[in-house]
C-alpha cells in the first residue's frame, strides 16, 4: 500500500446518455490519468544499518528508481548537502568515487544503487540519531534526494516482515517529465475533462480512500501529501541510544534499520542478505522527491515528532557544475 495522489472514482454514465462513445471517453481519461499521476516520477530509497558487531559502524545504501541516467550521487549526513549537511561521498558513474572521513568505503552496488560504509571513532563518528541523505542527479529528471535515520530501539516495527512503507508522493517536475507522449496524453485528458464540463456527464466522486478529495478536481493528493508540498525538507531525527535489541534476526545478531523502500514492485534489489532483512513497516521513513521531503506516516509531515527542516537554497539543479554534471 502506498499513499499517492488519489484518482477519483468515475461513476458509470447513466444509461442512454452517451452510449458506446461515452464509455470510451471515460476509459481513456482514466488510463491517461493513471499514467499522468504515476509515470515519470522517480524515487530514491535509503537504508541505514548499524552493524551489530561494531556499534559505531554504519552501512548506508541508497538507490534510484527512475528511467533516467544517473550522473552523480552525493551522500551526506546531518541533513541535505548544502543545507547544513556534510558530504561523506560523491560518486560519479564514470569519473570516479570520492569519500571523506568517517566514510570508509563508498561503492556502486548496481548501476542505480550505491553503498557506503562509515566507521566511527572519535568526534566524527555517527550515532543513532544521525540523518543520512542521498542525492541523485539524473537526466532528465533532475535532482532527487532522500534522507533516513535509524529508528528508535523501541520501534515496534523492527520485527515486522519486510513490508513496503507508505510513501508520500510529491509529484511536481516528475509528472510532466520523460515523455512527450505522456504530456500530450495529459493535455488531451484536460481537453476531455473540459468537454465533459460543458455537457451532461457522469459526476466525479471522490474515492473511498480519500474522503476529503475535492469533488471539482480531476485528482487530488491525499491530505498528508498536500501538506508535504509545502514542507521543503523534513527529516526525522531519532534519539541516540545504544543498541540493546534482543530481536531475533535472520542475519547474525541484532541490527537496526531505517529504510525507504517503495511499493513491492520496486523493492530495492540488492544482495540476498540485504533484500531479506526485516524492514520495519513503520519507522523513520522519509520520502524525498525532487527536493520535497515528507515523513511517511499518517500524520501530516509538519506535525511529526523530532522533525527537522532543511531548506535547500540551491534547488533541484544544484548538482550541476564541476562535479561532472554538465
Amino acid at each position: 500500500m502506498r499513499t499517492e495522489a488519489q484518482v477519483p472514482a468515475l461513476q458509470p454514465p447513466e444509461p442512454g446518455l452517451e452510449g458506446a462513445m461515452g464509455h470510451r471517453t471515460l476509459v481513456l481519461p482514466w488510463v491517461l490519468l493513471t499514467l499522468c499521476v504515476t509515470a515519470g516520477t522517480p524515487e530514491v530509497w535509503v537504508q541505514v544499518r548499524m552493524e551489530a558487531t561494531e556499534l559505531s559502524s554504519f552501512t548506508i545504501r541508497c538507490g534510484f528508481l527512475g528511467s533516467g541516467s544517473i550522473s552523480l550521487v552525493t551522500v551526506s549526513w546531518g541533513g541535505p548537502n548544502g543545507a547544513g549537511g556534510t558530504t561523506l561521498a560523491v560518486l560519479h558513474p564514470e569519473r570516479g568515487i570520492r569519500q571523506w572521513a568517517p566514510a570508509r568505503q563508498a561503492r556502486w552496488e548496481t548501476q542505480s544503487s550505491i553503498s557506503l560504509i562509515l566507521e566511527g571513532s572519535g568526534a566524527s563518528s555517527p550515532c543513532a540519531n544521525t540523518t543520512f541523505c542521498c542525492k541523485f542527479a539524473s537526466f532528465p529528471e533532475g535532482s532527487w534526494e532522500a534522507c533516513g535515520s535509524l529508528p528508535p530501539s523501541s520501534d515496534p516495527g523492527l520485527s515486522a516482515p519486510p513490508t513496503p512503507a507508505p510513501i508520500l508522493r510529491a509529484d511536481l517536475a516528475g509528472i510532466l517529465g520523460v515523455s512527450g507522449v505522456l504530456l500530450f496524453g495529459c493535455v488531451y485528458l484536460l481537453h476531455l475533462l473540459r468537454r465533459h464540463k460543458h455537457r451532461p456527464a457522469p459526476r466525479l466522486q471522490p474515492s473511498r480512500t480519500s474522503p476529503q478529495a475535492p469533488r471539482a478536481r480531476a485528482w487530488a493528493p491525499s491530505q498528508a501529501s498536500q501538506a508535504a508540498l509545502h514542507v521543503p525538507y523534513a527529516t526525522i531525527n531519532t534519539s541516540c541510544r545504544p543498541a540493546t535489541l534482543d530481536t531475533a534476526h535472520p542475519h547474525g545478531g541484532p541490527s537496526w534499520w531505517a529504510s525507504l523502500p517503495t511499493h513491492a514492485a520496486h523493492r530495492p534489489q540488492g544482495p540476498a542478505a540485504w533484500a531479506s532483512t526485516p524492514i520495519p513497516a513503520r519507522g523513520s521513513f522519509v520520502s524525498v522527491e525532487n527536493g520535497l521531503y515528507a515523513q511517511a506516516g499518517e500524520r501530516p509531515p509538519h506535525t511529526g515528532p523530532g522533525l527537522t527542516l532543511f531548506p535547500d537554497p540551491r534547488g533541484p539543479r544544484a548538482m550541476e557544475g564541476p562535479l561532472g554534471v554538465r
Epitope: S76, N81, G82, G85, T86, T87, V90, H92, P93, E94, R95, G96, I97, R98, W100, A101, R107, W108, E109, T110, Q111, S113, I114, R314, A318, G321, P322, L323, G324
Partner: antibody, heavy 114, light 113 residues
C-alpha cells in the same frame, strides 16, 4: 564558466614553508571540492590530496602526509595548500583541479633554492 | 597503490596518421557494481595544465574532438587518435580514477614528424 585561479610563482629557501592558493569561480560554493597535483620538472603527475568544502575534510596520498596541509576559506572561495620543511625535491609545478579533474588551475611554480 | 604503466614513452608520427598508446594498471579499474572502468586520459601541451580528454575509459569529455577514442577494460587500456593533427603534439597521461591515491602513468610523448 568555471575558473581556477592560482597564486603566482614562489621562490623559497630550504626548510621554509609556503602557502599557495587556488581561487574558484563560476560554480556553486559548496561544490569547491579541490584536488592538488604535483608535477616535478620533466616528470609525471602526482596526486597530493583533496579537500571537502563542507567540513574541510581531507584525503592525502600517503607520500604527502606531513608535507602538505589543505585548507579552505569559503568566504573567498579559495583553497590553500601549505607545504612545509621544503627541500629541493619539492620544487615543482603545483596544480589545483576540480573534484573529478575536469577543471585545472594554471599551475603555481615553486622553486626551493638557497 | 595502483601502478599505471604507459607505453611507448614517446612516439613520432606524421599528420593524418593513426596513433595508439597503451596504459596498463597493476589492479583492475573495473567497478563491478556498475561495470564501469575508472580510468581517465589527459592531454598536456607544453606550458599548460593537463586537460581531461577521456573518462570512464571511453567517454569523451565535452569539447574533445571525436578523433580521440578511449577503449579497454580491467587493466589494459588504449587511447587512439584516428588522424593526428599538428595541435595534438603533447604529453598524454592515463590516470587511475578508481581508488586513492589517484595515480598517473608516466606519460606518452607524442611528436609530429
Amino acid at each position: 564558466e568555471v575558473q581556477l585561479q592560482q597564486s603566482g610563482p614562489e621562490l623559497v629557501k630550504p626548510g621554509a614553508s609556503v602557502k599557495i592558493s587556488c581561487k574558484a569561480s563560476g560554480y556553486t560554493l559548496t561544490d569547491y571540492y579541490m584536488n592538488w597535483v604535483k608535477q616535478s620538472h620533466g616528470k609525471s603527475l602526482e596526486w597530493i590530496g583533496d579537500i571537502n568544502p563542507n567540513n574541510g575534510g581531507t584525503n592525502f596520498n600517503q607520500k604527502f602526509k606531513g608535507k602538505a596541509t589543505l585548507t579552505i576559506d569559503k568566504s573567498s572561495s579559495t583553497t590553500y595548500m601549505e607545504l612545509r620543511s621544503l627541500t629541493s625535491e619539492d620544487s615543482a609545478v603545483y596544480y589545483c583541479a576540480s573534484l573529478f579533474f575536469d577543471y585545472w588551475g594554471q599551475g603555481t611554480t615553486l622553486t626551493v633554492s638557497s | 597503490d595502483i601502478v599505471m604503466t604507459q607505453s611507448p614513452s614517446s612516439l613520432s608520427v606524421s599528420a593524418g596518421e593513426k596513433v595508439t598508446m597503451s596504459c596498463k594498471s597493476s589492479q583492475s579499474l573495473l567497478n563491478s557494481g556498475n561495470q564501469k572502468n575508472y580510468l581517465a586520459w589527459y592531454q598536456q601541451k607544453p606550458g599548460q595544465p593537463p586537460k581531461l580528454l577521456i573518462y570512464g575509459a571511453s567517454t569523451r569529455e565535452s569539447g574533445v574532438p571525436d578523433r580521440f577514442t578511449g577503449s579497454g577494460s580491467g587493466t589494459d587500456f588504449t587511447l587512439t587518435i584516428s588522424s593526428v593533427q599538428a595541435e595534438d603534439l603533447a604529453l598524454y597521461y592515463c590516470q587511475n580514477a578508481h581508488s586513492s591515491p589517484y595515480t598517473f602513468g608516466g606519460g606518452t610523448k607524442l611528436e609530429i614528424k
